[in-house]
C-alpha cells in the first residue's frame, strides 16, 4: 500500500510516457491519474517499468475498477498482466480472442502460470465450448494444453475443433483423455480416404476400440510400433495374430523388442503359440498347442 502524498510541483503526468520510469513509487501514486492510465494502457508495455512500479500502476487500476477491469483495459495490460492474481482475473469478462492472444503473448516461452490458467478457464467458459480458433491459439502457445483438461472438460470440444490438433498436442494425454477425443476425431475425419484418414487419426488411436483397430487392419495402414504401444490394452487383446500382422505391416518385426511391455506382453499371453510362431519372430509366452482357452469373463456375464 502506497501512502497518499501530494504530487510535487511540475510532476503531474500529462501522459503515460518513458519519463515515468524515473518516478519513485510514491510519485507514481501521487502524480499519475488512474483514468489517464486506463485510457493510455497501450503505452505501458512500451516502457520498462520495474516490478515495484507495476505494483503501483495495478493499485491505481484496482481503485478505478473495483469490480474488474473492462476488456478495453485488459487487452493492453501487457506485462502488467503478470501482476494479476487469479482472484483479479476471475472478475474479468474476456470475450475477444485478440485479448486472449495479447495476454498469452506476455507469458510466451514460460510455463503456464496460475494467472494464465485462470484466464483460459474464464475465456473458454465464457464461450461455452472450446472452438477451433481458441484451440488453435491455446495449443500454439501451450502445446500440452489439451492434455491438461479433464475428460469432462474435453467433452465440450466440438469435433470441428479437432482439425486444429497437432500430434505433439496429444503427447501427454492419458488414455481417459484419448477415450473422449478419439470419437470426436473419428467423426471429424470420417470423410477422408484411407491413407489420409490414418495420418490424421493416428495420434488419437490410444482411444480406439477393438472393432476400429480390426477395420484399420484391413486397410494396409502400416502402423508404427510407437503408435501400437499407445493403444488401449483392452482394445489390443482380442486382435488375432493375423490382424496385428496386417495392422503393423513391415513394422511387425518390432514386436520382438517390445514383447516384455504392455500391450504386447498381455497380447502375447492371449495368443496361441502356434499362431505366434507363424510370425517367425521368436515370440514366446503364448498358449501351448492343445490347451483349451475359457473366457471366464464371458461365463460370468452369462450367469
Amino acid at each position: 500500500e502506497v501512502e497518499k502524498t501530494a504530487c510535487p510541483s511540475g510532476k503531474k503526468a500529462r501522459e503515460i510516457d518513458e519519463s515515468l520510469i524515473f518516478y519513485k513509487k510514491w510519485e507514481l501514486e501521487a502524480c499519475v491519474d488512474a483514468a489517464l492510465l486506463a485510457t493510455q494502457m497501450d503505452r505501458v508495455n512500451a516502457i520498462p517499468f520495474t516490478y515495484e512500479q507495476l505494483d503501483v500502476l495495478k493499485h491505481k487500476l484496482d481503485e478505478l475498477y473495483p469490480q474488474g477491469y473492462p476488456e478495453s483495459v485488459i487487452q493492453h495490460l501487457g506485462y502488467l498482466f503478470l501482476k494479476m492474481s487469479p482472484e483479479d482475473i476471475r472478475k474479468w469478462n474476456v470475450t475477444s480472442l485478440e485479448t486472449l492472444k495479447a495476454l498469452l503473448e506476455v507469458n510466451k516461452g514460460h510455463e503456464m502460470s496460475p494467472q494464465v490458467a485462470t484466464l483460459i478457464d474464464r475465456f473458454v467458459k465464457g464461450r461455452g465450448q472450446l472452438d477451433k480458433d481458441t484451440l488453435d491459439t491455446l495449443t500454439a502457445f501451450y502445446p500440452g494444453y489439451l492434455c491438461s483438461l479433464s475428460p469432462e472438460e474435453l467433452s465440450s470440444v466440438p469435433p470441428s475443433s479437432i482439425w486444429a490438433v497437432r500430434p505433439q498436442d496429444l503427447d501427454t494425454c492419458d488414455p481417459r483423455q484419448l477415450d473422449v477425443l478419439y470419437p470426436k476425431a473419428r467423426l471429424a475425419f470420417q470423410n477422408m480416404n484411407g491413407s489420409e484418414y490414418f495420418v490424421k487419426i493416428q495420434s488419437f488411436l490410444g482411444g480406439a476400440p477393438t472393432e476400429d483397430l480390426k477395420a484399420l487392419s484391413q486397410q494396409n495402414v502400416s502402423m508404427d510400433l510407437a503408435t501400437f504401444m499407445k493403444l488401449r490394452t483392452d482394445a489390443v487383446l482380442p486382435l488375432t495374430v493375423a490382424e496385428v500382422q496386417k495392422l503393423l505391416g513391415p513394422h511387425v518385426e518390432g514386436l520382438k523388442a517390445e514383447e516384455r511391455h504392455r500391450p504386447v506382453r498381455d497380447w502375447i499371453l492371449r495368443q496361441r503359440q502356434d499362431d505366434l510362431d507363424t510370425l517367425g519372430l521368436g515370440l514366446q509366452g503364448g498358449i501351448p498347442n492343445g490347451y483349451l482357452v475359457l473366457d471366464l469373463s464371458m461365463q460370468e456375464a452369462l450367469s
Epitope: 512500451a46 520498462p48 520495474t50 506485462y79 503478470l82
Partner: nanobody, 115 residues
Framework: QVQLVESGGGLVQPGGSLRLSCAAS????????VAWYRQAPGEQREPVAA???????IYADSVKGRFTISRDNAKNTVYLQMSSLKPEDTAVYYC??????????WGQGTSVTVS
C-alpha cells in the same frame, strides 16, 4: 528461464569511458522496452537510461549527454556507452526489460569503479 548477463565493467579514471554490454536469452531485447539501472553501495537501484520498444531513449538527468543506450536486435544485446565518467558513477550496473523486469528477475550486474 530468462538469463541476463552484463559485462564490460571495470576500474576507470575520472573522465574515462566504458562500454557495458548486456546479453539476454531468447528474443527478449528485440521486442521489449529495456533499461540500464545502477546501484551504488548502500543505495537503492535506480534507472539510468531507457529505450522504449519503439526505440526512443531517455536518460536520468545525472547522466544526460554522457551516457548512450543502444541495442543490437540481431545479437539480442543492449549496450550502455559511458563517457566523461565521474566518481559518483561508481556502482553495479544492471540491465533489464520485458518479462524478467516485470517478474523482478535480475542478472549479476557488472561493477564500475571510477577512481
Amino acid at each position: 528461464q530468462v538469463q541476463l548477463v552484463e559485462s564490460g565493467g571495470g576500474l576507470v579514471q575520472p573522465g574515462g569511458s566504458l562500454r557495458l554490454s548486456c546479453a539476454a536469452s531468447g528474443s527478449m531485447f528485440s521486442i521489449n522496452a529495456v533499461a540500464w539501472y545502477r546501484q551504488a553501495p548502500g543505495e537503492q537501484r535506480e534507472p539510468v537510461a531507457a529505450m522504449t520498444s519503439g526505440g526512443s531513449t531517455i536518460y536520468a538527468d545525472s547522466v544526460k549527454g554522457r551516457f548512450t543506450i543502444s541495442r543490437d536486435n540481431a545479437k539480442n544485446t543492449v549496450y550502455l556507452q559511458m563517457s566523461s565518467l565521474k566518481p559518483e558513477d561508481t556502482a553495479v550496473y544492471y540491465c533489464n526489460g520485458g518479462w524478467s523486469l516485470a517478474m523482478d528477475y535480475w542478472g549479476q550486474g557488472t561493477s564500475v569503479t571510477v577512481s
